[in-house]
């Protein structure tokens, strides 16, 4: 048999058959099933759901479905000693206390085991002191406070609004500023869309709603006690003092009703400009401390959460490939939720479930994919991407040799406006071609392609007639596959028309109000957006696993490398005098990019012409495509971030959610004008240019003719 015959027993088993089998009604049913009780990582409820998914994937027809367990560090509130924040008077009496829980949504009043809002991995402590309002607690916010306003956060409790950047970066910045505690709150300016009602009457955040979330700075390490290695039965665990990424000061999240009570009394400096003001009826004074009448009052935090080594469970399903069983295409998304997980993660898990069911249906009819497809239901994503990272650490040797692609499948929706895709440039053409074949679910685009509605609503800033595709950052389970192992990765979901609020999430993110009803009533009553996301994610997996030649276009990497080189050069050129003084040149990088472009172009020509019936040559060309992403990995990693090893992309050092290009050079240049030793600082810039240039050149050479 030819390779084509082996994977397509009958001609009807093609992409269309797979896509036609996907049903919105099934996704809806699965979402309901997954969201009736909380599935917090490390709990019995989440273990039971893992076993249910294992059983159902087996029924759907996968070849094998196994549980992979690890014992990792998790964090929980103390059930008998709740966390809260007080305003205390001069006698130390608590005159105001923040709420201990979110008012439960209608129909969920009697549900047990709803974890109260907390910041996972906060240390215990009861600091008291004056409050300083630090806006979003971004790097630039602390620069404004410390450098321009001369406000010292040392020994203060800071209050920061959620949004713009990952909460862990906020806490890290506060620690570096000397704060002794952090209060995080959701300001309606960021979590309340004008003209929309609060839940349960709409999709906005009510005043008592609170965003949970971890506040780690793991930088890709996985389990804080076993960085680099799986947290298995014989693991050597670090002591808590040596654990990776744990915060050193107490942190607690609150809603905007409680925040109002803290912020309305703030005195001290006025906000520096309107960008520091939210939507509450408070002055947004920076402080420190309260105004006149209340100047003797202080804020006190009461945090009693505990860190505990706890067992977690991934579900790993396998659909063996007929021709290249040793090549893996992975579809993975997490299962654990903060509470009900109506959007995060179960809108994604329900889509994965339906994709598995569709693949299983085809398999039962005699079809197999060309390559092996692995399906994963990850645990403990909310606690720092732990399940996916531990599994990848355990299987790293297999993955680095056999991993073709990883498609992430967390929340399918964060809005219902248009598609949002973040992926490696290798997948741009795959995504473009696929979306041209899919129908748009959008109103006003009946009979039009998804590509057309997506391009209209979210145009590329560089190329007219094309949609925006963003860089991969982090904050989700693709991190270990892409940033550590160099496996081509992508993600897709439906999003909002809210470009300015890109990293704030949807209003009810990580709150108790993220329910099935939120999705069914307000976001996607017909589940048509979920179906479209299933088609995109599933279609990508199908093509990656089944196309004879891998659907990667290395020329698209050449285009972005030039763009990124131009961008980092222009940043450096803000310091022309220093570049001259320290002989900083980007010639090596631009030369490497030019070489990459030429070699990629030649490779693409050969890819069109080679004999696809020759399995050895086919395998060779596919391996060059598969290993191209791997070629961008530096085994030494980025400075102080050994698990971020991709030289072209890394999560921003200032916002884990955002991707940064040429991160080594970018970080070396960041705030360079403030460095005490400019010679050393510019020396590091030069070293990073060298590393980047070498890596691009080395990657280019992997695409050269092999002999």
């Amino acid at each position: 048999k030819s390779s084509n015959e082996a994977t397509n027993i009958t001609p009807k088993h093609n992409m269309k058959a797979f896509l036609d089998e996907l049903k919105a009604e099934n996704i809806k049913k699965f979402l309901y099933n997954f969201t009736q009780i909380p599935h917090l990582a490390g709990t019995e409820q989440n273990f039971q759901l893992a076993k249910q998914i294992q059983s159902q994937w087996k029924e759907f027809g996968l070849d094998s479905v196994e549980l992979a367990h690890y014992d990792v560090l998790l964090s929980y509130p103390n059930k008998t000693h709740p966390n809260y924040i007080s305003i205390i008077n001069e006698d130390g009496n608590e005159i105001f206390n923040t709420s201990l829980f979110e008012p439960p949504p209608p129909g969920y009043e009697n549900v047990s085991d709803i974890v109260p809002p907390f910041s996972a991995f906060s240390p215990q402590g009861m600091p008291e002191g004056d409050l300083v309002y630090v806006n979003y607690a971004r790097t630039e916010d602390f620069f404004k406070l410390e450098r321009d306003m001369k406000i010292n956060c040392s020994g203060k409790i800071v209050i920061a609004r959620y949004g713009k950047v990952f909460r862990g970066n906020k806490v890290k910045n506060a620690q570096l500023a000397g704060a002794k505690g952090v209060i995080l709150y959701s300001d309606p300016a960021d979590y309340f869309a004008p003209g929309v009602k609060s839940y349960p009457d709409g999709w906005n955040l009510p005043g008592g709603g609170v965003q949970r979330g971890n506040i780690l700075n793991l930088n890709g390490a996985g389990d804080p006690l076993t960085p680099g290695y799986p947290a298995n039965e014989y693991a050597y665990r670090r002591g808590i003092a040596e654990a990776v990424g744990l915060p050193s000061i107490p942190v607690h999240p609150i809603g905007y009703y409680d925040a109002q009570k803290l912020l309305e009394k703030m005195g001290g400096s006025a906000p520096p400009d309107s960008s520091w003001r939210g939507s509450l009826k408070v002055p947004y004074n920076v402080g420190p401390g309260f105004t006149g009448n209340f100047s003797t009052q202080k804020v006190k935090m009461h945090i009693h959460s505990t860190n505990e080594v706890t067992r977690i469970y991934n579900v790993i399903g396998t659909l063996r490939g007929a021709v290249e069983p040793d090549r893996y295409v992975i579809l993975g998304g997490h299962r654990d939720s903060w509470v009900f997980g109506g959007i995060d993660p179960q809108s994604g898990a329900a889509v994965v479930h339906e994709i598995v069911r569709s693949f299983g249906t085809l398999k039962k009819e005699g079809w197999r994919p060309r390559r092996t497809i692995l399906f994963a239901s990850w645990d403990a994503e909310e606690f720092g991407l732990l399940g996916s990272t531990e599994w990848a650490e355990e299987n790293s040797r297999l993955l680095q040799e056999r991993g073709v692609a990883y498609i992430n499948a967390d929340s399918s929706i964060e809005g219902n406006y248009t598609l949002r895709v973040d992926c490696t440039p290798l997948m741009y053409s795959l995504v473009h071609n696929l979306t041209k074949e899919l129908k748009s679910p959008d109103e006003g685009f009946e009979g039009k392609s998804l590509y057309e509605s997506w391009t209209k609503k979210s145009p590329s800033p560089e190329f007219s007639g094309m949609p925006r595709i963003s860089k991969l950052g982090s904050g989700n389970d693709f991190e270990v596959f892409f940033q550590r192992l160099g496996i081509a990765s992508g993600r897709a979901r439906y999003t909002k028309n809210w470009e300015t609020n890109k990293f704030s999430g949807y209003p009810l993110y990580h709150s108790v109000y993220e329910t099935y009803e939120l999705v069914e009533k307000f976001y996607d009553p017909m589940f048509k957006y979920h179906l479209t996301v299933a088609q995109v994610r599933g279609g990508m997996v199908f093509e990656l696993a089944n196309s004879i030649v891998l659907p990667f276009d290395c020329r698209d990497y050449a285009v972005v490398l030039r763009k990124y080189a131009d961008k980092i050069y222009s940043i450096s050129m803000k310091h022309p005098q220093e570049m001259k003084t320290y002989s900083v040149s980007f010639d090596s990088l631009f030369s490497a990019v030019k070489n990459f472009t030429e070699i990629a172009s030649k490779f693409s020509e050969r890819l069109q012409d080679f004999d696809k019936s020759n399995p050895i040559v086919l395998r060779m060309m596919n391996d060059q495509l598969m290993f191209l992403e791997r070629a961008f990995i530096d085994p030494l990693g980025l400075p102080d971030r050994p698990f971020y090893r991709h030289v072209i992309y890394a999560p921003s050092s200032h916002n884990k959610y955002a991707g940064e290009s040429f991160p080594g050079i970018y970080d070396a240049l960041f705030d360079i004008e403030s460095k005490v030793d400019p010679s050393k600082a510019w020396g590091e810039v030069k070293r990073q240019i060298y590393v980047a240039a070498f890596t691009v050149q080395a990657a280019a050479e992997t695409l050269s003719e092999v002999a």
Epitope: I87, I95, F96, G207, R277, S279, K281, P283, Y284
Partner: antibody, heavy 120, light 112 residues
Framework: QVQLVQSGAEVKKPGASVKLSCKAS????????INWVRQAPEQGLEWMGG????????NYNENFKGRVTMTIDTSSSTAYIELSRLTSDDTAVYYC?????????????WGQGTTVTVSS | DVVMTQTPLSLPVSLGDQASISCRSS???????????LHWYLQKPGQSPKLLIY???NRFSGVPDRFSGSGSGTDFTLKISRVEAEDLGVYFC?????????FGGGTKLEIK
């Protein structure tokens, strides 16, 4: 649903004090300030002040300073206003009203009113 | 204190007519956070006041769309596009930007 139920009508002599109550239900009492507004016969509305059930903080209209005391009992979700040294000018309907917090910051729910008559 | 001046004192209308009430404040009602806390209430005979419009132009829950608010700074207007019998009563503007909160003197909407 949000409800504010006020105590019954009062008749007082000049120089006396009166204490009115306002029992709240249907929402989390500590999240919303309670305002007191009065309306003299055939007159407009006059804000007397407000109290925050969360911390007991009060904000009085200067016109009533020294004569008005607002208190709360969080255990029964009840707000109280006491007005002393009454004169005939204090004859009015006294309303409690919930301060609606974000996004309203307006009095989004009112009690039915308590009529206070000051007469010798 | 911020003085709120409402005009007219009385507004006789026929059912189905448009009605317009003006409210002027003695100082700007723009809060330091950029919002304007100017609200409109309706008090029907024998009843407590009820919130109609908050923050200049936002209809409160359940308020028909024939009511609209506009204005900025110190000048504000409430419009009723087609007056219905249930709209009759006294309309008050009010500000909660500055303490003490203050109310306009009221405008009585009555049948011609």
């Amino acid at each position: 649903q949000v409800q504010l139920v006020q105590s019954g009508a009062e008749v007082k002599k000049p120089g006396a004090s009166v204490k009115l109550s306002c029992k709240a239900s249907g929402y989390t009492f500590t999240y919303f300030d309670i305002n007191w507004v009065r309306q003299a016969p055939e007159q407009g509305l006059e804000w007397m002040g407000g109290i925050s059930p969360g911390d007991g903080n009060t904000n009085y209209n200067e016109n009533f300073k020294g004569r008005v005391t607002m208190t709360i009992d969080t255990s029964s979700s009840t707000a109280y206003i006491e007005l002393s040294r009454l004169t005939s000018d204090d004859t009015a309907v006294y309303y409690c009203a919930r301060d609606g917090n974000f996004p309203y910051y307006a009095m989004d729910s009112w009690g039915q009113g308590t009529t206070v008559t000051v007469s010798s | 204190d911020v003085v709120m001046t409402q005009t007219p004192l009385s507004l006789p209308v026929s059912l189905g007519d448009q009605a317009s009430i003006s409210c002027r404040s003695s100082q700007s009602l723009v809060h330091s956070n950029g919002n304007t806390y100017l609200h409109w209430y309706l008090q029907k005979p024998g009843q407590s006041p009820k919130l109609l419009i908050y923050k200049v132009s936002n209809r409160f829950s359940g308020v028909p769309d024939r009511f609209s608010g506009s204005g900025s700074g110190t000048d504000f207007t409430l419009k009723i596009s087609r007056v219905e019998a249930e709209d009759l009563g006294v309309y008050f503007c009010s500000q909660s930007t500055h303490v003490p909160y203050t109310f306009g003197g009221g405008t009585k909407l009555e049948i011609k």
